[in-house]
């Protein structure tokens, strides 16, 4: 975050930006920036693998839910979107693309369907779905 | 927007931020920044007037929908929230807090209810509601 005060003094600007205001990012152009994470919702339906590839091509990953507080904007997301959560049948755990295990109390897993991938739904719910089913998806990029 | 390239050269940083990446804002701390507008969703239910006062106290206004393209993140908003749209009974028009008239084709107005205020709902819908009914609300701040 570039403190507005710092930027003001640096460039000796006249414009007064309140102390409580700050810049967010950096993010890819036209992505959503929130609490220094970048998010983008993609309208086109792809299977989980294609969605993952699409995010990777943009130097991002599929959505990872790591904090209800830092990601509370996700509460209000309408519809269902691929996130980066996959089921590991060998040990029965759910893990993120980066290999970390899903922590308890972050997501409610809802098993209506056979499948090893999960769709994000509002209020921190994850719906199990067949990985080859086309769905919209959310990419995420953590800022440095 | 502070170009990442500009910031890099300014501070002679090693970290390579792609040309396509940029900063968003400035916004109040922990607000959502998208296409250089700032948004915040408030959980507590207030009537329209209280919601307006809450936004004003944060140097913002209730949500104004001015562009489906620049505000396409609103497509995916779940639930119903006060926005800054009010009905002017004298001429039958709908106008924003800043006095501008609602442009055609921006919102679908749905009259379920008698009222002079409107709730924003996903996919650019506006539900007419009694202004004294408590609801959650969206504040918005346009960046300079």
């Amino acid at each position: 975050i570039w403190s507005a005060v710092f930027l003001n003094s640096l460039f000796n600007q006249e414009v007064q930006i309140p102390l409580t205001e700050s810049y967010c990012g950096p993010c890819p152009k036209n992505w959503i920036c929130y609490k220094n994470n970048c998010y983008q919702f993609f309208d086109e339906s792809k299977n989980w693998y294609e969605s993952q590839a699409s995010c990777m091509s943009q130097n991002a990953s599929l959505l990872k839910v790591y904090s209800k507080e830092d990601q509370d904007l996700l509460k209000l997301v309408k519809s269902y979107h691929w996130m980066g959560l996959v089921h590991i049948p060998t040990n029965g755990s759910w893990q993120w693309e980066d290999g970390s295990i899903l922590s308890p109390n972050l997501l409610t897993i809802i098993e209506m369907q056979k499948g090893d991938c999960a769709l994000y739904a509002s209020s921190f719910k994850g719906y199990i779905e067949n990985c080859s089913t086309p769905n919209t998806y959310i990419c995420m990029q953590r800022t440095v | 927007i502070w170009s990442a390239v500009f910031l890099n050269s300014l501070f002679n940083q090693e970290v390579q931020i792609p040309l396509t990446e940029s900063y968003c804002g400035p916004c109040p701390k922990n607000w959502i920044c998208y296409k250089n507008n700032c948004y915040q969703f408030f959980d507590e239910s207030k009537n329209w007037y209280e919601s307006q006062a809450s936004c004003m106290s944060q140097n913002a206004s209730l949500l104004k929908v001015y562009s489906k393209e620049d505000q396409d993140l609103l497509k995916l908003v779940k639930s119903y929230h006060w926005m800054g749209l009010v009905h002017i009974p004298t001429n039958g028009s709908w106008q924003w807090e800043d006095g501008s008239i609602l442009s055609p084709n921006l919102l679908t107005i749905i009259e379920m209810q008698k009222g002079d205020c409107a709730l924003y709902a996903s996919s650019f819908k506006g539900y007419i509601e009694n202004c004294s009914t408590p609801n959650t609300y969206i504040c918005m701040q346009r960046t300079v």
């Epitope: 755990s93 759910w94 997501l107 409610t108 897993i109 098993e111 209506m112 056979k114 719910k125 | -």
Partner: antibody, heavy 131, light 106 residues
Framework: EVQLVQSGAEVKKPGATVKISCKVS????????MHWVQQAPGKGLEWMGL????????IYAEKFQGRVTITADTSTDTAYMELSSLRSEDTAVYYC????????????????????????WGQGTTVTVSS | SYELTQPLSVSVALGQTARITCGGN??????VHWYQQKPGQAPVLVIY???NRPSGIPERFSGSNSGNTATLTISRAQAGDEADYYC?????????FGGGTKLTVL
């Protein structure tokens, strides 16, 4: 004994709204989603939607989207289905049904919900729409 | 939207085996549930998740699911099995029922 008891038969005029209740007993209301299913005379079953009583989240069938509102009142252990802008084709029996069970300690200590079918049904409520 | 196809009617001789099919594109990748409904009564779940029986449902009821067809099998059919039978799946965030099959026990 697990029971779902629905409100009585209704006769409504076209354009009106009907609200049916489904009072549960014999289990913890918030541990199962509640579904509503329509059955027109001589026809098959049609799923209308569901509610998670824990947080009020709903999912509606596309056919009924915009006309149906499903709610749950945890203070009275009652689910409701409201159908608006009634037309003659809405003449049917409406069932509430329990399904999707909460398992607080699923694999890896995660909170899980499993769908094992709609295992308990209400007795049905007949709604007649006629002018 | 996803479609489930059931035969309108199936007949079986008393004591014989009845098979009711439910067709759907790649249905084997989905969980299939079966319901029995007798005239004037609410439906009853008889099979869940392809092949599991709820408590109280006789062993004569069994289910299978692979490829494009799910099957409900009722062995040693009894007069009391005469009813409408519906299959059900979850697809695209909606529950879908088949059109129903009327089972007649001769």
């Amino acid at each position: 004994e697990v029971q779902l008891v629905q409100s009585g038969a209704e006769v409504k005029k076209p354009g009106a709204t009907v609200k049916i209740s489904c009072k549960v007993s014999g289990y913890t209301f918030t541990d199962y989603y509640m579904h509503w299913v329509q059955q027109a005379p001589g026809k098959g079953l049609e799923w209308m939607g569901l509610v998670d009583p824990e947080d009020g989240e709903t999912i509606y069938a596309e056919k009924f989207q915009g006309r149906v509102t499903i709610t749950a009142d945890t203070s009275t252990d009652t689910a409701y289905m409201e159908l608006s802008s009634l037309r003659s084709e809405d003449t049917a029996v409406y069932y509430c049904a329990r399904g999707i069970a909460r398992y607080p300690n699923g694999p890896g200590g995660l909170l899980y919900y499993y769908y094992y079918g709609m295992d308990v049904w209400g007795q049905g409520t007949t709604v007649t729409v006629s002018s | 939207s996803y479609e489930l196809t059931q035969p309108l009617s199936v007949s079986v001789a008393l004591g014989q085996t009845a098979r009711i099919t439910c067709g759907g594109n790649n249905i084997g990748s989905k969980n299939v549930h079966w319901y029995q409904q007798k005239p004037g009564q609410a439906p009853v779940l008889v099979i869940y998740r392809d092949s599991n029986r709820p408590s109280g449902i006789p062993e004569r009821f069994s289910g299978s699911n692979s490829g494009n067809t799910a099957t409900l099998t009722i062995s040693r059919a009894q007069a009391g099995d005469e009813a409408d039978y519906y299959c059900q799946v979850w697809d695209s965030f909606a529950f879908v029922f088949g059109g129903g099959t009327k089972l007649t026990v001769l």
